[in-house]
Amino acid sequence: MKVLQEPTCVSDYMSISTCEWKMNGPTNCSTELRLLYQLVFLLSEAHTCIPENNGGAGCVCHLLMDDVVSADNYTLDLWAGQQLLWKGSFKPSEHVKPRAPGNLTVHTNVSDTLLLTWSNPYPPDNYLYNHLTYAVNIWSENDPADFRIYNVTYLEPSLRIAASTLKSGISYRARVRAWAQCYNTTWSEWSPSTKWHNSYREPFEQ
């Protein structure tokens, strides 16, 4: 049994890091493998992650972590029974994928203005809380070409757009994702999308 693609890990910089790797053949990850991880820190304890299958030869493990900070560094040991298959390390702050924003809501009752709001996925005491920026994707269910991205570079998790910038009388969907420049993160996954019917009063032509 050998590792074909070494584990690569990403952290949500809060409580979970996800590691994925591939074996050289079909593997029952949960029964045959264990990923041991330990913070390189005084008094830290070793933890064991039981991997799940991710395709025939692929495995994925969700590592639970406490109080993630930039100085943290973890040792990783991948075991098959008594055999050490791979040894490595992982610094969560250098491989951050933020959590997806939640509770995306479209408020359509503000005089011909659409107000989109969502929730910051981090608590205020997490460093990323004040450092997320967002991308909002709006698209038409009827017209695949009607697809737009709004970059929200301020901290407030909201976006106002004129209803008239979208077509009237048709349904739209929106979703939002986040990233943080400070840790050079990847983009989060998209939030679940929300749907609304866009309608507004056309101004009278004189």
Partner: antibody, heavy 116, light 111 residues
Framework: QVQLVQSGAEVKKPGASVKVSCKAS????????MHWARQAPGQGLEWMGI????????SYAQKFQGRVSMTRDTSTSTVYMELSSLRSEDTAVYYC?????????WGKGTLVTVSS | QSVLTQPPSVSAAPGQKVTISCSGG????????VSWYQQLPGTAPKLLIY???KRPSGIPDRFSGSKSGTTATLAITGLQTGDEADYYC????????????FGTGTKLTVL
């Protein structure tokens, strides 16, 4: 919000021991290390040691080795710092502080006076 | 005796800028991150800066930190009378044993 509530002031005689408590609330108790530091009157801060509330293991500054003990009670989310063989130079305010590499939140402090 | 040296006192007028240095060595500041704590008279210390230059939520951006080599610096702009306090730097050492030294402390007076 995070709160670290420390026990009240103590007056002790030289040679005695003192046990200071720090009750934590507002966060997952076992997820954060706890430090202890002290400050003698008019002096600076001095680090004493650190405890991992999950397993209960602790490590102490060399200066206090053999004289200090840090423990925890997960059922009450409380950490304790016991200092023995007290001398007058141990008169200080003793602080618990939550954190790992740095101390995010501090208790208000417990004044321990050692006097004959 | 602390291995991190700070000036005993600094002073400046309201609205001015002041800097406080924290000098260490390769085994502490040079190899770790620095944090800064503010201790108002009669109160417990409060975290101002961690990770050399990051501010916890609620700390105004008038406070900033930096590090170069074995020296860290805390800068406070737009000084206010409420900033009058003792300031301590801190770091950690992992050479033979792990320890968390604090700086000697600096008394800031707002004139």
């Amino acid at each position: 919000q995070v709160q670290l509530v420390q026990s009240g002031a103590e007056v002790k005689k030289p040679g005695a021991s003192v046990k200071v408590s720090c009750k934590a609330s507002g966060y997952a108790f076992t997820s954060y290390y706890m430090h202890w530091a002290r400050q003698a009157p008019g002096q600076g801060l001095e680090w004493m040691g650190i405890i991992n509330p999950r397993g209960g293991s602790a490590s102490y500054a060399q200066k206090f080795q053999g004289r200090v003990s840090m423990t925890r009670d997960t059922s009450t989310s409380t950490v304790y710092m016991e200092l023995s063989s007290l001398r007058s130079e141990d008169t200080a305010v003793y602080y618990c502080a939550r954190g790992k590499y740095w101390m995010y939140d501090w208790g208000k402090g417990t004044l321990v006076t050692v006097s004959s | 005796q602390s291995v991190l040296t700070q000036p005993p006192s600094v002073s400046a007028a309201p609205g001015q800028k002041v800097t406080i240095s924290c000098s260490g060595g390769s085994s502490n500041i040079g190899n770790s991150y620095v944090s800064w704590y503010q201790q108002l008279p009669g109160t417990a210390p409060k975290l101002l800066i961690y990770d050399n230059n990051k501010r916890p939520s609620g700390i105004p951006d008038r406070f900033s930190g930096s590090k170069s080599g074995t020296t860290a610096t805390l800068a406070i702009t737009g000084l206010q009378t409420g900033d009058e306090a003792d300031y301590y730097c801190g770091t950690w050492v992992t050479s033979t044993v792990w320890e968390w030294p604090f700086g000697t402390g600096t008394k800031l007076t707002v004139l």
